[in-house]
């Protein structure tokens, strides 16, 4: 089938990095500057992606592969192939219609991207707050209040007593 196809279609012989030039009797011509073809048999070359503004070049365009972009410092990629750059915020903030804003009380964000999320509600799991939450950190839940009351049996069994002279493993 491949041999038959190449007899019928001379363009199938054009390798990546070239295009089948109809204006030149279907000769394989190299892709012009700032364009590429990543597969053989192409009748046109694709325009190279340009990384501009907040986008910076991670990989230069070649005759056989497109350029790849990432974001300048202070921004991070969103979408497939870094199709968007979004401004970073500080931990404890989120990006709003007014730019970066501190998380409201009761919420936190431990990253430079994304939204502020509510603190964990320890009481829903029957636990108490061991460490208070901040704008940057979630609360840390500890044992349930009942576990902390005097005389209550501990959920975790006590560690076995060590014999004198034995060091722990």
């Amino acid at each position: 089938f491949e041999r038959t196809r190449s007899l019928q279609d001379p363009c199938s012989n054009c390798p990546a990095g070239t295009f089948c030039d109809n204006n030149r009797n279907q000769i394989c011509s190299p892709c012009p500057p700032n364009s590429f073809s990543s597969a053989g048999g192409q009748r046109t070359c694709d325009i190279c992606r340009q990384c501009k503004g907040v986008f910076r070049t991670r990989k230069e365009c070649s005759s056989t592969s497109n350029a790849e972009c990432d974001c300048t410092p202070g921004f991070h990629c969103l979408g497939a192939g870094c199709s968007m750059c979004e401004q970073d915020c500080k931990q404890g903030q989120e990006l709003t219609k007014k730019g970066c804003k501190d998380c409201c009380f009761g919420t936190f964000n431990d990253q430079k991207r994304g939204i502020c999320r509510p603190w964990t509600n320890c009481s829903l799991d029957g636990k108490s707050v061991l460490v208070n939450g901040t704008k940057e950190r979630d609360v840390v839940c500890g044992p349930s209040p009942a576990d902390l009351s005097p005389g209550a049996s501990s959920v975790t069994p006590p560690a076995p007593a060590r014999e004198p002279g034995h060091s722990p493993q």
């Epitope: 501009k52 503004g53 986008f55 199709s83 979004e86 401004q87 709003t96």
Partner: nanobody, 122 residues
Framework: EVDLVESGGGLVQPGGSLRLSCAAS????????MSWARQAPGKGFEWVSG???????YYVDSVEGRFTISRDNAKNTVYLQMNSLKPEDTAVYYC????????????????WGQGTQVTVSS
């Protein structure tokens, strides 16, 4: 071919004013959201302001009340009126299309101008 050309930058004293212009060509300006960004010396880019095709405007907190973005669709131009300028406003200011229409977000298909320098100093 798409072209964005900024002008109006310069040296101004603290408290002074400047009006930046961005002349656009090569695309349907009236249907495009537009934005201004800036890059201070040794710092990263910062989203400053944006305007939707319908005229809704958005600003980063640090310039709200001092800067005003506007557009003239008949002239294919977007403006940034900057009043009460501060030394920390010193930066290269860039005009860009704003396909994402999200604060602080630009799309790979957005077009960017070459920038105009604004220096606020006494």
């Amino acid at each position: 071919e798409v072209d964005l050309v900024e002008s109006g930058g310069g040296l101004v004293q603290p408290g002074g004013s400047l009006r930046l212009s961005c002349a656009a060509s090569g695309f349907t300006f009236s249907r495009s959201a537009m934005s201004w960004a800036r890059q201070a010396p040794g710092k990263g880019f910062e989203w400053v302001s944006g305007i939707y095709s319908g005229g809704s405007t958005y600003y980063v907190d640090s310039v709200e009340g001092r800067f005003t973005i506007s557009r003239d669709n008949a002239k294919n131009t977007v403006y940034l009126q900057m009043n009460s300028l501060k030394p920390e406003d010193t930066a290269v200011y860039y005009c860009a299309t704003w396909g994402s229409q999200q604060i602080g977000v630009w799309h790979e298909d957005d077009y960017w101008g070459q920038g105009t320098q604004v220096t606020v100093s006494s």
